[in-house]
């Protein structure tokens, strides 16, 4: 017939299954004069032939794996062999059959994995090839682990991505693999074609030997670095190594320093980039991180400790330009006048900061020189020769040489002779009550004001008050500054408060004079006061990296397929546990450690896409604070819904007897996605026996006409089966039934005697 198997010369495409012996011609081209013959050129492979009269055929079975498309050209020639039409392209598409089995590229694979490697991160790929068409099930491969040897406690340590062949550790494998216990494993892996879904799929197996290696991602020993180094920088100080090459290293400064003098190169070598100053900062703690090429951490960060070693690069410094001490008139020989505390910024308790004190001059030398002595190492001034008289000499000036092992400094001390100290400081309140503060209250904050008074000579060491915390603050988190004019004490935070180590502190203050009390007078309860400091915990919830996470998968993914993942971090650095909320369809599960989301049930786009669930990130430990983010799973359509009738067609009737052949129109639909052009259904009768009575013809992609072929129908109901094909990939077919009644009519409607069956047809044709 013209059209399907014969016709004029024009570009055409034909699809032929491979492996089939030729059974019919491909096409008969018709010549228009003056054309008398046809010529075939292109990728004929001596298989495709055109006869002189235009008969195109093939002479042996095709093989898609040799050539999947034959690009041919056909030209019409006149009697002289001159092209008068064409050449036109003729494309032969060779359709695939499952005539090739999958084969692994290797019969044995070898790989290694580090203990504690991240679960789900591939460390080895097995790879099989199947010469069949990967766009069809024939070439779609499905990988599986058949057996793991040894299998300890029936726990799988390894898993395989059934589509990619990527082998990785399970969560149990990440936690439990230990080369000291079991250094090697063997897996038997199978691969099947037909997506693993068919009984007649071909398969192959391979063996995988896996060596478990030690994890060398370990924190190095603490480093000591001498300050003020004059060597050229940067200087390598230590190193970290990821287990495999190619890691991207970085350093994280948890302290957020304005100047961070360290760097790391892509070998994992850590450098100090400039000379350090111990007096600026004597120790550094930071973290080394290893990431993969996508910026994803390969493991936990390593803590790096750097201690800065001291050199004697600081001279002693005087506490002030002039240090003022007071001595009471009647003090006895040997009494302490005060201690000159010079400072040295070099490291405490080392020779670099060990100071010597020596008096080099006293003025006036009245009534004699050498009235004072200073303890060589302690710096304590003492009355050396006799008691002093205020009316004779009310003030002495001393020059004191303070030295460390390399430097000398002169300090100046003024000693005032004052009245006797016979009054003690008295607190205006003995109990300052409770004070509640958050643990993140700023250092330097004044949290309390205290006040004591002293009746001795004003503005002398006898009336000046020093406040000390004598109990309840062994860590030295608090301090008290005194206003010298009012003797008011301001309690300030010197070190960060810590809920974990000191939630409640019972603080006791003592008020004392710098000058000793006269003999017989003692400090009593009036010079003491207390208060209670309550510290509250501060905690921040984990933070998700995105407000909404989105992933896209085909609705037909295998159960257990990873469909997405979420990430959150805890500001306090606590581990995070992930969970799902609102998984109303029970389609998903989340790995509570990694945040990877897997399917646990068949997905269905037609039930609704995107599928929205909430993901919850909860701190592990601490106050278990949690945050919520959205996960949207976009489901891509596959052709998994057969066509059906668009509405209920019960009640179709023809008036009996038919005066002429009649017809009715019906509509089909399906639930799959039809982008742009809408469905393209084809319609045919559901069984051969119907063809004598009925005919079905397509009107458009969704509508068809059912027509009677004659008028000789009985007065009864006929059930006409219609086959509707959606032409999808794979094509799905629905067989629907149209009940058509032939009945006697009254005024164009079916007549039924009273009491007859229910469900009277209501639509006449």
């Amino acid at each position: 017939q013209e059209g399907k198997f014969s016709g004029p010369l024009k570009p055409m495409t034909f699809s032929i299954y491979e492996g089939q012996e030729p059974s019919q011609i491909i096409f008969q081209f018709k010549a228009n004069p003056p054309a008398v013959t046809f010529e075939l050129t292109g990728e004929t492979d001596n298989i495709f032939v055109i006869e002189r009269e235009g008969l195109l055929y093939y002479n042996r079975a095709l093989d898609r794996e040799t050539r999947s498309t034959h690009n041919l050209q056909v030209a019409a020639l006149d009697a002289n062999g001159i092209i008068v039409e064409g050449p036109v392209p003729i494309t032969i598409k060779v359709k695939d059959i499952n005539d090739n089995r999958p084969t692994f590229l290797q019969s044995k694979y070898e790989g290694s994995v580090r203990q504690n490697s991240r679960p789900g991160k591939p460390f080895l790929y097995v790879n099989a090839t199947d010469l069949d068409d990967p766009a069809t099930p024939n070439g779609q491969l499905y990988y599986q682990i058949v057996i793991q040897l040894p299998m300890i406690n029936n726990v799988m340590y390894f898993q395989i991505n059934n589509k990619t062949g990527a082998i990785s550790l399970t969560r149990e494998g990440s936690q439990e693999l230990n080369p000291a216990k079991n250094p090697s494993y063997n897996l038997v892996i199978s691969v099947k074609d037909m997506g693993g879904q068919s009984e007649n799929s071909f398969s192959d197996t391979t063996s995988v030997d896996i060596i478990v290696t030690e994890n060398i991602w370990k924190a190095p020993k603490p480093v000591e670095m001498v300050e003020n180094s004059t060597d050229p920088h940067p200087i390598k100080i230590t190193q970290v190594r990821w287990n495999d090459p190619g890691a991207q290293y970085s350093l994280v400064d948890k302290e957020k320093l304005p100047r961070f003098p360290f760097s790391i190169d892509q070998e994992g070598d850590i450098y100090v980039t400039q000379p350090l100053d111990r007096e600026e900062k004597d120790a550094y703690v930071f973290y080394a991180v290893a990431k993969d090429e996508y910026g994803k951490p390969l493991s936990y960060p390593l803590e790096i400790h750097v201690k800065v070693k001291d050199i004697n690069d600081n001279p002693p410094t005087c506490p002030s330009p002039v240090t003022v001490f007071e001595v009471q008139e009647n003090e006895r020989l040997g009494n302490s006048i005060g201690t000159l505390t010079a400072h040295d910024r070099d490291e405490e308790n080392t020779a670099n900061s060990f100071l010597n004190y020596r008096i080099v001059e006293q003025t006036p030398k009245l009534p004699m020189d050498g009235l004072f002595l200073i303890q060589t190492y302690a710096g304590m001034l003492q009355l050396a020769k006799q008691s002093l008289k205020k009316q004779d000499t009310p003030q002495y000036n001393l020059t004191i040489e303070v030295s460390d092992k390399d430097f000398k400094t002169l300090c100046f001390v003024q000693i005032n002779v004052i009245d006797i100290n016979d009054q003690i400081p008295i607190f205006e309140k003995s109990d300052y009550g409770n004070l509640t503060l958050a643990e993140d209250t700023n250092i330097g904050s004044t949290i309390l004001t205290i006040q004591a008074t002293d009746a001795d000579e004003p503005f002398t060491g006898s009336s000046k008050i020093l406040y000390h915390i004598i109990k309840g603050d062994s860590e030295g988190r608090l301090g008290v500054d005194t206003d010298p004019h009012t003797n008011t004490g301001y309690v300030i935070i010197k070190k960060p408060l810590d809920f974990e180590t000191a939630a409640v502190s019972n603080i006791v203050f003592k008020a004392e004079n710098p000058e000793p009390l006269v003999f017989g007078v003692k400090y009593n309860a009036s010079s003491f006061a207390k208060f209670t400091l309550i510290v509250t915990d501060v905690n921040e919830a984990p933070q998700f990296s995105q407000h909404v996470f989105q992933a896209k998968v085909s609705e037909d993914v295998a159960i257990g397929t990873k469909v997405g993942n979420v990430t959150a971090k805890d500001p306090e650095g606590l581990d995070i546990s992930y969970s799902l909320r609102g998984d109303t369809r029970g389609w998903l599960k989340i790995d509570h450690v990694t945040g990877e989301i897997f399917s646990v049930a068949p997905l269905d786009r037609e039930a609704g896409s995107p599928y929205r669930v909430q993901v919850v990130a909860t701190e592990v430990g601490g106050s278990s604070l949690s945050s919520v983010s959205e996960f949207h799973l976009i489901l891509m359509d596959v052709n998994d819904n057969p066509p059906r009738l668009a509405k209920d067609y019960t009640g179709l009737f023809f008036c009996h007897p038919l005066s002429a052949p009649g017809s009715l129109i019906f509509e089909a639909t399906d639930d799959d996605q039809h982008l742009f052009r809408g469905p393209h259904f084809t319609f045919s009768l559901g069984s051969g026996s119907l063809q004598n009575d009925w005919e079905v013809s397509k009107i458009n992609g969704t509508h068809a006409r059912l027509s009677t072929r004659h008028t000789e129908f009985e007065e009864r109901e006929y059930v006409v089966l219609i086959r509707i094909n959606d032409g999808g990939r794979p094509p799905l077919e629905g067989i629907v039934s149209l009940p058509v009644t032939f009945c006697s009519c009254v005024e164009g409607s079916c007549f039924r005697p009273a009491g007859h069956q229910t469900g009277i047809p209501t639509v006449g044709m």
Partner: antibody, heavy 123, light 113 residues
């Protein structure tokens, strides 16, 4: 061997007609086209047209339409060219030639020629 | 119609000399589908019918001496005789078979000095 034997020289009066023959041998007559050329002394060759005996397809040079008529007799393997309304301008040597191409061959040229027929038109 | 122009119309050479003659067409003879030039060269000796030398512009017919060479493409073609012999005295025609009506050039007459 292939031969194309043309009819003998003709002397005809102006206004008359003449039919020149070209009898072939040594190959299947219907496989190849037969072409006719006109050659006047000291002038080049002019292509008149061809006939394909198998399907009796003809094609003419527009210049010779109405002047020449090409026919073939398969039974005698002979091609004919009739020239009518003759004038002195038609005086020339007329050559038949076989075009080398046939289905499956690649000979795109005139491979065999007749010996020529001299036509003289004179009163 | 495609007009074929040959030059020179005649030339005289001594035996052993090289000779080239030109043939130009009024439109391209190169067919896009097969990249062939639809041109042939013929030799017509005195008192004889023409005989093919070259077809497809450069393919030498079997039995033709290799001193005859055809070249060119599109609209410009050349016939070269590398070492003329006395038996090469003839008129040489080019002919196009790209489109009907087929046409011949006016010919180049080769004379021997």
């Amino acid at each position: 061997q292939v031969q194309l034997q043309q009819s003998d020289a003709e002397l005809v009066k102006p206004g008359a007609s003449v039919k020149i023959s070209c009898k072939v041998s040594g190959y299947t007559f219907t496989d190849h086209t037969i072409h006719w050329m006109k050659q006047r002394p000291e002038q080049g060759l002019e292509w008149i047209g061809y006939i394909y005996p198998r399907d009796v397809i003809t094609q003419y040079n527009e210049k010779f339409k109405g002047k020449a008529t090409l026919t073939a007799d398969k039974s005698s393997s002979t091609a004919y060219m009739q020239l009518n309304s003759l004038t002195s301008e038609d005086s020339a040597v007329y050559l038949c030639a076989r075009w080398g191409y046939f289905y499956g061959s690649r000979s795109y040229y005139f491979d065999y020629w007749g010996q020529g027929t001299t036509l003289t038109v004179s009163s | 119609d495609i007009v074929m122009s040959q030059s020179p119309s005649s030339l005289a050479v001594s035996v052993g000399e090289k000779v080239t003659m030109s043939c130009k067409s009024s439109q391209s003879l190169l067919h896009s589908s097969n990249q062939k030039n639809y041109l042939a060269w013929y030799q017509q000796k005195p008192g004889q019918s023409p005989k093919v030398l070259i077809y497809w512009a450069s393919t030498r017919e079997s039995g033709v001496p290799d001193r005859f060479t055809g070249s060119g493409s599109g609209t410009d073609f050349t016939l070269t005789i590398t070492s003329v012999k006395s038996e090469d005295l003839a008129v040489y025609y080019c002919q196009q078979y790209y489109s009907y009506p087929w046409t011949f050039g006016g010919g180049t007459r080769l004379e021997i000095k």
